[in-house]
């Protein structure tokens, strides 16, 4: 189970993980106390048949080719959480682990 | 955490789970002993901004809008295994649980 890693200038056409730093202050998300920025990463690229397919199911759907089914798309296949300090809706300060905030690997599904 | 369910006649445009029966015999996959057919399901539909987004990460990437990033796509967000009886490459009969063979839920990621 592997995935490609690219940098932001790469002309790689296949499904790849790219670096992306999310800046909460720049978005005006002032309810987030910490971190103000974090490395989120994102997935982009083409999913040619069989390349980086995560599941046999993807291959089966391609073979069955039902009406309206699109090809597989480049999407996170492994994600990890980050710890965040933030205000909730009641203005209480919460410290917690927020799941699926960082893309660790991209694949076609 | 929910997903839409549609049938093959539905005019729903959004990301939805559709029924699909995979027929191994029709594919010529004669190394599979059982089941010969199973309900795999598949995902199809549009991922308008925020609709059925599985992760906050998806929203953040949309907001950051990095070069080359596509919008979220309709993909399995929950899958389950099936038990299969099949010949392996050494012509031995194997009974095992094959992961991620059935789509239980679709979402945008």
């Amino acid at each position: 189970d592997f995935g490609l890693d690219c940098d932001e200038h790469s002309t790689e056409s296949r499904c790849c993980r790219y670096p992306l730093t999310v800046d909460f202050e720049a978005f005006g998300w002032d309810w987030i106390i910490a971190p103000k920025r974090y490395k989120a990463n994102y997935c982009s690229g083409e999913c040619e048949f069989v390349f980086l397919q995560k599941y046999p199911h993807t291959h089966l759907v391609h073979q069955a080719n039902p009406r309206g089914s699109a090809g597989p798309c480049c999407t996170p296949t492994k994600m990890s959480p980050i710890n965040m300090l933030y205000f909730n809706g009641k203005e209480q300060i919460i410290y917690g682990k927020i799941p699926a905030m960082v893309v660790d690997r991209c694949g076609c599904s | 955490d929910f997903g839409l369910d549609c049938d093959e006649h539905s005019t729903e445009s959004r990301c939805c789970r559709y029924p699909l029966t995979v027929d191994f015999e029709a594919f010529g996959w004669d190394w599979i002993i059982a089941p010969k057919r199973y309900k795999a399901n598949y995902c199809s539909g549009e991922c308008e901004f925020v609709f059925l987004q599985k992760y906050p990460h998806t929203h953040l990437v949309h907001q950051a809008n990095p070069r080359g990033s596509a919008g979220p796509c309709c993909t399995p967000t929950k899958m389950s295994p099936i038990n299969m009886l099949y010949f392996n490459g050494k012509e031995q009969i194997i009974y095992g649980k094959i992961p991620a063979m059935v789509v239980d839920r679709c979402g945008c990621s």
Epitope: S10, S13, R14, E46 | S69, A70
Partner: antibody
């Protein structure tokens, strides 16, 4: 025969808009990335924009980012370039070009159209 | 962005002679480099991709070499139809960039 035919060029005032089209034939259009490359009169080639085969990924030169939009209609085998907020320096022949898919990188174009002339002048 | 420098700007060669064109990149582009030929009033024509592979239908007198930052296009014996402008292009990084061109003219 593989062919690309551009249209939609013309004379437009600064600040104006145009939509260029490129009709493709002779190959499986949706399988190939496409680019727009321009050439100002008497000058060299300048890459403008590219789009993946599916249309899911788009790329732009810094000089046109925010003003030009590339898109494609795979059902009609057609590539588009929407040109907004045009400037005198956008005056050029605009060529559409098919990606050769020689390896996994976008960029080397094996088929080019003859181009359509865009003139930005008051 | 990666800056492409072609030299010489103009090359005067007699038919039948050898022509050597140079392309230098400001940073490594691996082998992701192409050469194009353009004649007046015509669209560019792909000659070489991957730094050294001839495109379909390109005569064997055209050859490319190099990798990293230094590349060469060689025309072993110039024919009358080879007098044109030649451009190198890197496709390793966005934005894609072209060299300024080398005009090969009849001596």
């Amino acid at each position: 025969e593989v062919q690309l035919l551009e249209s939609g060029g013309g004379l437009v005032q600064p600040g104006g808009s145009l939509r260029l089209s490129c009709a493709a034939s002779g190959f499986t259009f949706s399988s190939y990335a496409m680019s727009w490359v321009r050439q100002a009169p008497g000058k060299g080639l300048e890459w403008v924009s590219a789009i993946s085969g599916s249309g899911g990924s788009t790329f732009y030169a810094d000089s046109v980012t925010g003003r030009f939009t590339i898109s494609r209609d795979n059902s009609k085998n057609t590539l588009f370039l929407q040109l907004n907020s045009l400037r005198a320096e956008d005056t050029a022949v605009y060529h559409c070009a098919k990606d050769g898919r020689f390896n996994w990188n976008y960029g080397a174009s094996d088929i080019w159209g003859q181009g359509t002339m865009v003139t930005v002048s008051s | 962005e990666i800056v492409m420098t072609q030299s010489p700007a103009t090359l005067s060669v007699s038919p039948g002679e050898r022509a050597t064109l140079s392309c230098r990149t400001s940073q490594s582009v691996s082998s992701n480099l192409a050469w194009y030929q353009q004649k007046p009033g015509q669209a560019p024509r792909l000659l070489i991709y991957g730094a050294s592979t001839r495109a379909t239908g390109i005569p064997a007198r055209f050859s490319g070499s190099g990798s990293g930052t230094e590349f060469t296009l060689t025309i072993s014996s110039l024919q009358s139809e080879d007098f044109a402008v030649y451009y190198c292009q890197q496709y390793n990084n966005w934005p894609l960039t072209f060299g300024g061109g080398t005009k090969v003219e009849i001596k």
